[in-house]
């Protein structure tokens, strides 16, 4: 097809475009100190940065969105940087019956793209 | 668990929060006039609007992001409005050997959430 291909080089300069960044957060930051027991400090990988035209387009829809944003910036928003995949996280937390270890699949980003 | 639940009422007023909106686009708008033959006008559903705290959170990661954005707005971006699902679209387009009908699964948004 004649679809435009997503590009991976950032035209805005280093660190400006959509990428994964680690944010340190405590259970207090997250409001979780009443139910999560461990880990007490979390390494939260999040997606940050801008999505210039066709940069890391998630799919055809994102390419269309980028194109239409160029034509109608007031009506169509630019694509934005969101997780493309996640890393499982094991939390030790309270339950009604005691304490449990549970894996959460949608908590920490592993990769990012522009959607 | 003690996770905050995503909320569905928009605190910003009607039409301001993340929702699905239809945008009319021609093949020329999309740069597709040289390879797509039909339809010549597309009804493109896109996700637009803001993502206030916990509005239509996609998952736990989005809830965390909303919380940390409140604490560190310069470092952590707010969640943004992106497709949660897509509607398949059939396009008639040129191929090397003639004309083909093809279904595209990631072209038009069907639902939106804040990620």
């Amino acid at each position: 097809s004649a679809h435009a291909h997503p590009r991976d080089s950032c035209p805005l300069g280093p660190g400006r475009c959509c990428h994964l960044e680690t944010v340190q957060a405590t259970l207090e930051d997250l409001g979780w100190s009443d139910w999560v027991l461990s880990p007490r400090q979390l390494q939260l990988s999040m997606c940050v940065g801008e999505c210039p035209h066709l940069y890391r387009s998630a799919n055809t829809h994102a390419q269309i969105k980028a194109r239409l944003h160029g034509l109608q910036p007031d009506k169509v928003p630019a694509p934005c940087c969101v997780p493309s995949s996640y890393t499982p996280v094991v939390l030790m937390h309270r339950t009604d019956s005691g304490v449990s270890l549970q894996t959460y699949d949608d908590l920490v980003a592993r990769g990012c793209h522009c959607a | 668990s003690a996770h905050a639940h995503p909320r569905d009422s928009c605190p910003l007023g009607p039409g301001r929060c993340c929702h699905l909106e239809t945008v009319q686009a021609t093949l020329e708008d999309l740069g597709w006039s040289d390879w797509v033959l039909s339809p010549r006008q597309l009804q493109l559903s896109m996700c637009v609007g803001e993502c206030p705290h916990l509005y239509r959170s996609a998952n736990t990661h989005a809830q965390i992001k909303a919380r940390l954005h409140g604490l560190q707005p310069d470092k952590v971006p707010a969640p943004c409005c992106v497709p949660s699902s897509y509607t398949p679209v059939v396009l008639m387009h040129r191929t090397d050997s003639g004309v083909s009908l093809q279904t595209y699964d990631d072209l038009v948004a069907r639902g939106c959430h804040c990620a």
Epitope: T22, S38, Q43, T87, T103 | -
Partner: antibody, heavy 119, light 112 residues
């Protein structure tokens, strides 16, 4: 079922660097909340926490060993490694790798490998 | 670092009888969330340590219910309600409240 296996030389000369690798099987090393840990046990003695690493590469070291320890992770090989520099006879020990939730709950351990520091 | 002290050093036991090991920390292990950050491990002869109890009183997966942990603050106890021959080995307490985690010196449990 997660399994851990230490590997590396059993004999290291004084002043050299001790290098051990722990291979994780039966599960991914790339999980948040998990600290991949090194613990040692001097002959006939108790246990000493050396340090740990998260899948992201963040490291945590025992202050008593910090100046000599480096722990690294290779997610593509599902392995993490320990390097202990400038070893002396006092570093002779059985070295264990283990999986913990942060600094606790070491629920999976390697079988341990004896490293002797001697010329 | 938090210092962990175990007693007794050695504990001869009779199969079928109860046994008790004490562990004391140099500062309170009680977190503001109400949990005591203390683990218990058993190292059987020639084996790696195995987790018995975490957060003071929670039995790890697969651990028989004859093992129980109790205590709060600075004083903790591991109890075996009825000792079996397979329970012999060295028992360690470990504080997990703050880094570095530190272990007690161990209590050797052996059959009389």
């Amino acid at each position: 079922q997660v399994q851990l296996q230490e590997s590396g030389p059993g004999l290291v000369k004084p002043s050299q660097t001790l290098s051990l690798t722990c291979t994780v099987s039966g599960g991914s090393i790339s999980s948040g909340g998990i600290y991949w840990t090194w613990i040692r046990q001097h002959p006939g003695k108790g246990l000493e926490w050396i340090g740990a690493i998260a899948y992201s590469g963040s490291t945590y070291y025992n202050p008593s060993l910090k100046s000599r320890v480096t722990i690294s992770v290779d997610t593509s090989k599902n392995q993490f490694s320990l390097k202990l520099s400038s070893v002396t006879a006092a570093d002779t020990a059985v070295y264990y790798c283990a999986r913990g939730i942060e600094y606790q709950h070491f629920d999976y351990w390697g079988q341990g490998t004896l490293v002797t520091v001697s010329s | 670092d938090i210092v962990m002290t175990q007693s007794p050093l050695s504990l001869p036991v009779t199969p079928g009888e109860p046994a008790s090991i004490s562990c004391r920390s140099s500062q309170s292990l009680l977190h503001s969330n109400g949990y005591n950050y203390l683990d218990w491990y058993l190292q059987k002869p020639g084996q790696s340590p195995q987790l018995l109890i975490y957060l003071g009183s929670n039995r790890a997966s697969g651990v028989p219910d004859r093992f129980s942990g109790s205590g709060s603050g600075t004083d903790f106890t591991l109890k075996i309600s009825r000792v079996e021959a397979e329970d012999v080995g060295v028992y360690y307490c470990m504080q997990t409240l703050e880094a570095p985690p530190t272990f007690g010196g161990g209590t050797k449990v052996e059959i009389k």
